[in-house]
């Protein structure tokens, strides 16, 4: 990796400057794509901030950027004006350039902020040169709020500063009035005043009357040393504008402004809704606006006024629809800081907000909503609903356009059909099953973000409260006991106070689930089972005949059972038991109780002891207590009216206050 470019950036005070390839240019001997040349900001700027043009400029400090983003002019340094005047200030950024597998390269970017620089957006080299407004025929004090050369003084080291001053030499006098210092008029023989006199409020402009034409004066300002000696240092030649206003003038009244909304890269006219004033004694053409600060998301343009940005326009331009905003590629909202004047009153600050709307939004559904079976309810999160456009949309709003079939959406415990992303992020939006006839549900929402909408379907599934443990591989050709060591809904039984039921939905592909006789004396062989209960598991009444995969050589295989589990007062859930199988190995200890082993293995062994007798299950894996009446926890059940009772039972909590009575087990 190598780093070229000057590694220096010159910035005008209070302005934004993009980093460019002249400033920072990384390359690699491998000709790496600029997208893969990554800069990390090790230490950010002290006098301003670094941000990305396409991202929210008010957010976090920029931590990473690429060479490609530098080339695109998207990495910006913004100098923040300090409260104290300065002439030149220096800032540094410490960066680390990386592009594996090459070794990282450290870089320092030096930033010079100087009033010396030629700044189009800041034509004065002084700390302040704002001009003056004066009523016709009257006088006004020129203070440091309007004209201030303190920054020239700031170039002198602070110990010597008190011995220095700034000399203003008037090179062209006002034509419609007079400048006075301590009540003495300035003239060709005495064309000077000092920064110290300005700071003391001793400089006055007196208008001579006879009209409201513009006035002003030109000057040269430079440092003056002790005893009035001229010293080397910064200097500038500028003009100071004086606006004369009619004393009878009524100032214009700005009206409330509606933000302009448009999509990225588009153009929209600015109307009176965005910019208008009430001024009974001025024509629209006399009301002038000037852009003081423009946002980064686009510019203003006038129809017929060329392609470039405009910084001055009138109310007439707005009223006639000639003024438009042209959005660039940025997705960030911005504000124009404007000043508005009717030419006779002091300028009034105004602002125009520009919201960039996404051209499209997408509802991201990362995962279905999983509802724990025993609870029957779950909060939605960003995993289910999150809106993105060219960025995340934290202020998205949602409206239910197709409700769930088996439950309700609740906010604050009440059914709702509208909610916000904020409520989702706070965990306040809850889906609750109210009809327990399905293990899944779905609902459709319409998401709205910054004027754009999109719809999405949220799927809801129930997570079974079932402990499943297959252990190691199971022997093909054997019958093994299905009991709570393999499948256990005991916790669901405790939580619901009922005997959970299972229904076999699918599988096994090779084999079958059977009910086994309790003892040798019990008549009949094993019966095929499609439905069973937790009690059957606890009683050891179930077996799984593990088949051999047909049409292939003997060897390990995989199989599974898919079951639906349901219990009282909770939604059903689908669960699966995945297990591996292998040809029976008499020498291997299996982790499950075998009720029978393959016929061939028995014949080979020739001993009845080599298998567990088919008729008699081994010792019980769990207590013969039934799977109910083990707790005293309050139930919270949801019911929903089926036929016309929705309003009565609308997502109502039914609290069950009962210490469950123990039941005796009957065989």
């Amino acid at each position: 990796l190598s780093l070229k470019g000057s590694q220096t950036l010159t910035v005008c005070p209070g302005s934004v400057q993009p980093l460019s390839s002249q400033t920072l240019r990384a390359s690699s001997s491998a000709g790496t794509d600029p997208q893969l040349l990554l800069y990390r900001v090790v230490r950010g700027p002290q006098l301003g901030r670094l941000f990305h043009a396409q991202q929210d400029s008010t957010g976090e400090a920029l931590v990473n950027f690429t060479q490609a983003e530098v080339y695109a002019g998207n990495i910006l340094y913004e100098h923040e004006m300090p409260p104290e005047p300065f002439w030149e200030a220096h800032d540094t950024l410490e960066l680390q350039l990386s592009s594996p597998p090459a070794r990282d390269v450290a870089a320092t970017l030096a930033v010079a902020v100087s009033f010396e620089a030629a700044c189009p957006q800041h034509p004065s080299h002084l700390w302040k040169n704002k001009g003056l407004w004066v009523p016709e025929g009257q006088r006004a004090r020129i203070t440091v709020a309007a004209l201030d050369a303190s920054n020239l003084l700031a170039s002198v080291p602070s110990p010597q500063r008190s011995e220095h001053d700034v000399l203003f030499q008037v090179t062209q006098f006002p034509s419609r009035g007079q400048l006075l210092v301590s009540e003495e008029p300035l003239h060709a023989g005495q064309p000077h005043f000092l920064q110290s006199q300005l700071a003391a409020g001793q400089l006055v402009y007196a208008h001579g009357g006879g009209g409201t034409q513009q006035d002003g004066f030109h000057f040269r300002a430079h440092l003056q040393g002790p005893a009035g000696a001229s010293v080397a240092g910064p200097q500038t030649s500028e003009a100071f504008a004086i606006t004369v206003r009619d004393v009878n003038e009524r100032p214009p009244q700005p009206q409330a402004s509606v933000p302009l909304r448009l999509t990225r890269g588009s153009r929209a006219p600015i109307s009176r809704a965005q910019l208008s004033v009430v001024d009974p004694d001025s024509a629209p053409g006399e009301i002038e606006y000037e852009v003081q600060r423009a946002p980064h998301n686009g510019f203003l343009s006038l129809v017929g006024g060329g392609l470039g940005p405009v910084t001055r326009f009138t109310q007439a331009d707005v009223d006639s629809g000639r003024l438009a905003f042209v959005a660039n590629g940025s997705s960030v909202a911005g504000i124009f800081q404007l000043s508005m004047s009717d030419g006779a009153s002091p300028p009034l600050p105004m602002s125009l907000a520009v919201d960039i709307l996404p051209s499209a939004i997408e509802v991201q559904l990362r995962a279905p909503l999983e509802v724990p079976q025993a609870l029957g309810r779950s909060s939605l999160s960003q995993q289910q609903l999150r809106v993105v456009s060219d960025r995340e949309e934290p202020e998205a709003a949602y409206r239910l356009i197709q409700g769930p079939q088996y439950g309700h959406l609740l906010v604050g415990g009440r059914p709702t059909s509208a909610f916000s992303q904020f409520q989702i992020d706070q965990g306040e939006v809850v889906f609750a099953f109210t009809n327990f006839s399905s293990s899944h549900d779905h609902f459709r929402v319409l998401a709205l973000a910054r004027g754009v909408n999109a719809s999405a379907v949220v799927n809801v599934t129930v997570r079974a409260l079932l402990h499943v443990w297959a252990g190691g591989p199971w022997p093909q050709g054997a019958t093994l006991r299905l009991d709570p060591t393999v499948l256990d809904a005991g916790e669901l039984a405790n939580r619901t106070g009922s005997v959970p039921r299972f229904r076999l939905l699918e599988g096994p592909r090779h084999g079958r689930v059977v009910r086994v006789p309790r003892a040798r004396t019990e008549p009949g062989g094993s019966q095929l089972v499609e439905q069973f209960t937790q009690q059957d598991l606890e009683d050891g009444r179930l077996g799984l005949e593990v088949g051999r995969p047909e049409g292939r050589a003997p060897g390990p295989a995989g199989d599974s059972l898919t079951l639906e589990l349901w219990a009282q007062g909770v939604p059903p859930a689908v669960a699966s038991l995945d297990f591996a199988t292998e040809p029976y190995n008499a020498a291997r200890p299996y982790s499950v109780a075998l009720l029978s082993v393959p016929e061939a293995a028995r014949t080979e062994a020739g001993k009845p002891e080599s298998s567990t007798p088919t008729g008699e299950p081994g010792p019980m894996a769990s207590s013969p207590e039934p799977a109910v009446a083990k707790g005293g926890v309050d139930e919270q059940l949801y019911f929903q009216g089926g036929s016309g009772l929705n309003d009565i039972f609308e997502a109502q909590k039914i609290e069950w206050h009962e210490a469950r009575a123990h039941h005796h087990h009957h065989h």
């Epitope: 006839s437 009922s498 209960t533 109910v628 009446a629 019911f639």
Partner: nanobody, 116 residues
């Protein structure tokens, strides 16, 4: 199409008895959980009793324990709620609910009024 129909409600004096029936059609109650739920005017909903129709396991709300008995008769495909020693506070509309494999039905309700 009617799934559950309750009957047996009516006006009874305090201390009296009633037997509510819940007849199921188009599904078998043998493998369901049956619950009796009541809603009194201006009050919330209360699950008073429930039964597992395979095993006969029952549960009761404290307010009715020892006075109400829930049962299933799978041959008649009907569940019952025997209510003894009735009190004024038992006045409500009583609904029967059945929950089973991929089903969850409610009846239309039957009104029980306990008043002297």
């Amino acid at each position: 199409e009617v799934q559950l129909v309750e009957s047996g409600g009516g006006l009874v004096q305090p201390g009296g008895s009633l037997r509510l029936s819940c007849a199921a059609s188009s599904f078998n109650i043998k493998d369901t959980y049956i619950g009796w739920v009541r809603r009194a005017p201006g009050k919330g909903t209360e699950l008073v009793a429930s039964i597992d129709c395979i095993y006969g396991y029952t549960r009761y709300a404290d307010s009715v324990k020892g006075r109400f008995t829930i049962s299933c008769d799978t041959s008649k495909n009907t569940a019952y709620l025997q209510m003894n020693s009735l009190r004024a506070e038992d006045t409500a509309v009583y609904y029967c609910a059945a929950q089973g494999y991929r089903l969850h039905y409610w009846g239309q309700g039957t009104t029980v009024t306990v008043s002297s």
